[in-house]
């Protein structure tokens, strides 16, 4: 419940300033307090507007100041009202005339069901008049002017809820501003019991706490605080958790302090009268010094705390020995926590003698709902309360209270949540490249609803007719590949964003669907590519039997070494060779092939083949002559590629003999670098020539090299390396 | 252990007013949501509506908006639903049914036994 | 709104029998989910929410299971006791809606 506080100061009007002013201690933002006139409790009271001002000295507190000049407009009843969402507290309290002919015994009057009341008004003024005596406006009793008594009374043997009202009392010839005010407050319940059928036993409220008739709790006196009103708080402090504090010069000195029903008004501790500025006899404490103290072992009574009990005593009376008691304290709870919409634990940890216990622990939501703990434990010196809140939503964002009310005294510790909205994309993720065991993504995370920042991306992703759970891949780039996925298969795909903190896993965005193409099939067999012409290549190929039904044809890829061009025919899958034309003359091309259906097929090894040269080849270079024995000798030599040299021709003859004389060794595989000259004279010298033949024609030797065999007895010189025809 | 009783049901006239009450319980009744629910004879469950523990929050399903009014008093544990304009289709036995904790948003753990409401000229 | 699709709407089935009633959200409803178990002129009883978690007192044969569209509730071993209607409710918003029911009956 809201701690809501009205302090009437003064309310009995004489010439003096007097003033209303109502505090909404502690945490909680609230609707505006109210203040106003209580035409409930007195209809035919003033009817001005009243002028209601900011406390500047506290955050959320209201004010009335009455100037002096304007006493007579004041007699009536108010009300202050503050507001939590759907809870209203309403607060009660009357001002009169100092001057008026009866003055009640006290502001208000608490009382039990059933309870036999007097509610008295004392006579100040003697006049030849009848008394007469209202109710909420209402007459109900009278006494002739010869049987006033001194002291006035409406007796009521056994009061009832309906009992319960402002009481007035004047003698017949006055009005409102000569009238005396009481409030009569009946609580719901006979003495010491709470509940909506009356059926519970408070708690044994002391200093003068009462036991509110709907929750069983204590409304502490000001100047008491805790479970059961039995610890007080520092001096001239008041308030549930005593935080808030009488600024005047002699503390709470002519303060009235009016607290919600059924408590009513009374002095702070330490003061009585109607006017709150009388000073407790000795031995008396409490609010209106009610209280006795008793103090056992000739403790000290102080008039606003009672007993002051030494160290390892304790009680009202300090009748008890045992560890001095400690206010309870809240640690560990952060001013602001952020918290994802879902499953919410909050912790309330506390510390104090006596350790508070699990019903002494409660969450107050910004809506004022009280929770209470579904788990909790203790160590020496700390109880921890663990709540549940089932789902929390960002309109339980606000001001937490962790609230911890104990014997040894009340505290409160307020902290902000702020509860995030998961993060869920805006758009499905985009398809960018598929094949059949692949998917290439583009997981358009961006924009999201919700809350960031994002501290992870997970792309899930399922086939569409299997009931297979999602699986998931994390992401960090916005591309993303997906492998080893099935062929010819519908998939699902969609991007579920992850905020920090537990819980922080959005909703998956937008769904995408997609298919993966078909397996490919095998590249064609029997590749085989040759040059045709210098602007054309044959590639061929084995016919083709595919095992399925689909139409398929032949995709070749053939490019350049030298250049960038490249190019890509479609040939009928019942062919079984293309003619590769349009191409340059003596031109390295690579070339590769693939059986495509509706899916692409895999691609063959690369196969490089020369276009046939439109020059006349080069000339065989680092031609060498080695190995020379007195009958043989190895002739070695290199080409140049891409001449279309098809073949080489060595030519040797005796030197000095006729140009029709010489033997021609004709090599026809082109890839033969050496040869080996056999049968030839011992010591004798051979003139040798060496040239390439391709489609044009013959290379034409620049000049001859010489050989000259040894005699037979010699052995050979060293063989180079080399491929070699014997 | 948690009871919730309603009451207050009965055969009222199209066009109508009715006020349900549902009596909670063996719980601390101010810390949990509380909805109603109903069923109409032969057919499934639909939610009517919900309200905070605090009374602040208040939900209602497109059916009855403007027409039905829910309310609770902690200190009587008592939750309400005001029916007016009420027309046949509102024909079911309405239960009131406890959230799982003061989440507005959550599944019913309580159900009360059902009181029937039957509109009818 | 969100929808709330049962299947079956009958299920047939024996006594030792294991079953499965699937329910389908129209939108994603992450993992805010309750059964129900409903007798003829009885209230509805609470027995999974959270989609899997299985309330105090519920037997263990009762279980339930999945997350953003796709939910079912499964019974391991069918008791004479389980032969009820079952209804599936989405809290993920308001306004909370539950599915048309399925009916479990002896065969």
């Known amino acids: 419940a809201m701690d809501l506080i009205l302090i009437n100061s003064l309310p009995l009007v004489s010439d003096a300033e007097t003033s209303l002013t109502c505090i909404a201690s502690g945490w909680r933002p609230h609707e505006p307090i109210t203040i106003g006139r209580d035409f409930e409790a007195l209809m035919n009271q003033h009817q001005d507007p009243l002028e209601v001002t900011q406390d500047v000295t506290r955050e959320w507190a209201k004010k009335v100041v009455w100037k002096r000049e304007k006493a007579s407009k004041i007699n009536g009843a108010y009300f202050c009202e503050g507001r939590v969402r759907g809870e209203a507290i309403r607060i009660r309290t009357m001002k009169m005339r100092q001057q008026a002919s009866f003055l009640p015994a006290t502001l208000t009057m608490t009382v039990d069901k059933g309870d036999n009341v007097n509610i008295s008004f004392k006579k100040v003024l003697i006049k030849e008049e009848d008394a007469v005596i209202y109710k909420n406006g209402s007459f109900i009793h009278s006494v002739p002017r010869h049987e006033v008594p001194d002291i006035l009374e409406v007796h009521l043997p056994h009061a009832q809820p309906q009992d319960a009202g402002v009481y007035s009392a004047r003698y017949i010839g006055g009005n409102l501003f000569t009238s005396a005010f009481t409030r009569l407050i009946v609580r719901r319940c006979e003495a010491q019991k709470w509940g909506p059928e009356c059926n519970h036993l408070c708690t044994a409220c002391m200093n003068n706490g009462v036991c509110h008739e709907d929750t069983g709790e204590c409304i502490c006196p000001p100047g008491f605080m805790g479970r059961t009103c039995e610890k007080a708080c520092e001096l001239h402090t008041f308030g549930r958790t005593c935080k808030e504090r009488c600024s005047g010069q002699e503390g709470c000195k002519s303060y009235v302090f009016c607290l919600p029903d059924p408590y009513g008004c009374s002095c702070a501790t330490g003061w009585k009268g109607l006017q709150c500025n009388e000073a407790c006899h000795p031995g008396f404490y409490g609010p209106d010094c009610k209280l006795r103290c008793s103090c056992n072992n000739g403790e000290m009574c102080d008039r606003f705390q009672g007993c002051l009990c030494s160290p390892g005593w304790q009680g009202l009376q300090c009748e008890r020995e045992g560890i001095q008691r400690m206010t309870p304290k809240i640690v560990d709870l952060p001013d602001h926590i952020e918290v994802n919409s879902g499953k919410f634990n909050p912790i309330c940890k506390a510390s104090g003698w006596p350790l508070p216990t699990n019903e002494e622990m409660t969450l107050v939501k910004p809506d004022g709902t009280v929770l209470h703990p579904k788990d909790f434990n203790h160590t020496d010196h700390f109880s921890v309360a663990i709540f549940t809140i089932h789902r929390i939503l960002p309109p339980d964002s606000g001001v937490w209270v962790c609230s911890v009310n104990t014997v040894a005294g009340m505290v409160e510790k307020p902290f902000n949540i702020s509860v995030k909205v998961l993060p869920k994309p805006l758009n499905a993720p985009n398809v960018i490249d598929t094949g059949h065991n692949f998917a290439v993504i583009n997981i358009s995370s961006e924009p999201y609803f919700g809350d960031g920042p994002i501290k992870s991306k997970k792309l899930l992703y399922k086939p569409v007719n299997h009931y297979e759970a999602w699986q998931h891949i994390q992401v960090t780039n916005e591309i993303v590949t997906l492998n080893y996925l099935e062929p010819r298969t519908e998939y699902e795909l969609c991007v579920q964003l992850v905020r920090r903190g537990e819980g922080g896993e959005g909703h998956p965005g937008p769904v995408r669907r997609f298919t993966t193409a078909s397996i490919g099939l095998p590249p064609p067999r029997g590749l085989n590519l040759l040059p045709k012409s210098q602007t054309t290549l044959n590639l061929t190929w084995q016919p083709i039997f595919p095992s399925s039904e689909d139409d398929f044809y032949v995709e070749v890829e053939r490019r350049s070494v030298q250049k960038s061009d490249q190019q890509n025919i479609k040939v009928p899958g019942n062919l079984t060779s293309v003619l590769l034309n349009n191409l340059h003359p003596r031109e390295q091309y690579v070339v590769r092939a693939r059986v495509n259906t509706k899916a692409q097929g895999e691609w063959s090894e690369d196969l490089t083949a020369w276009t046939l040269s439109d020059i006349l080849p080069p000339q065989p270079e680092n031609i060498k002559i080695s190995n020379i024995t007195h009958s043989s000798a190895v002739i070695s030599w290199t080409i140049l590629d891409g001449y279309s040299i098809s073949s080489i021709t060595i030519r040797y003859k005796v030197q000095g003999k006729n140009e029709d004389q010489h033997v021609d060794v004709k090599i026809k595989n082109a890839t033969i670098t050496q040869y080996q000259l056999k049968g030839l004279e011992p010591e004798t010298a051979y003139q040798v020539d060496i040239f390439a033949e391709n489609n044009i024609g013959s290379s034409n030797p620049a000049f001859s090299h010489e050989l000259v065999t040894l005699p037979e007895s010699q052995a050979p010189a060293d063989l180079g390396g080399g491929k070699m025809l014997l | 252990q948690v009871q919730l009783v309603e009451s207050g049901g009965g055969l009222v006239q199209p066009g109508g007013s009715l006020r349900l009450s549902c009596a909670a319980s063996g719980f601390t009744f101010s810390s949990y949501a509380m909805s109603w629910v109903r069923q109409a004879p032969g057919k499934g469950l639909e939610w009517v509506s919900a309200i905070s523990g605090s009374g602040g929050s208040t939900y209602y399903a497109d059916s009855v908006k403007g027409r039905f009014t829910i309310s609770r008093d902690n200190s009587k544990n008592t939750l309400y639903l005001q029916m007016n304009s009420l027309r046949a289709e509102d024909t079911a036995v309405y239960y009131c049914?406890?959230?799982?904790?003061?989440?507005?948003?959550?599944?019913?753990?309580?159900w009360g036994q059902g009181t029937l409401i039957t509109v009818s000229s | 709104d969100i929808q709330m699709t049962q299947s079956p709407s009958t299920l047939s089935a024996s006594v030792g029998d294991r079953v499965t009633i699937t329910c389908r959200a129209s939108q994603s409803i992450s993992r805010w989910l309750a059964w129900y178990q409903q007798k003829p002129g009885k209230a509805p009883k609470f027995l999974i929410y959270e989609a899997s978690t299985l309330e105090s007192g519920v037997p263990s044969r009762f279980s339930g299971s999945g997350t953003g569209t796709e939910f079912t509730l499964t019974i391991s071993s069918l008791q004479p006791d389980d032969f009820a209607t079952y209804y599936c409710?989405?809290?993920?918003?308001?306004?909370?809606?539950f599915g048309q029911g399925t009916r479990l009956e002896i065969k």
């Open positions: 409710q989405q809290y993920e918003d308001y306004p909370l809606t």
């Open positions: 049914a406890r959230g799982v904790d003061s989440s507005m948003v959550t599944g019913f753990d309580h």
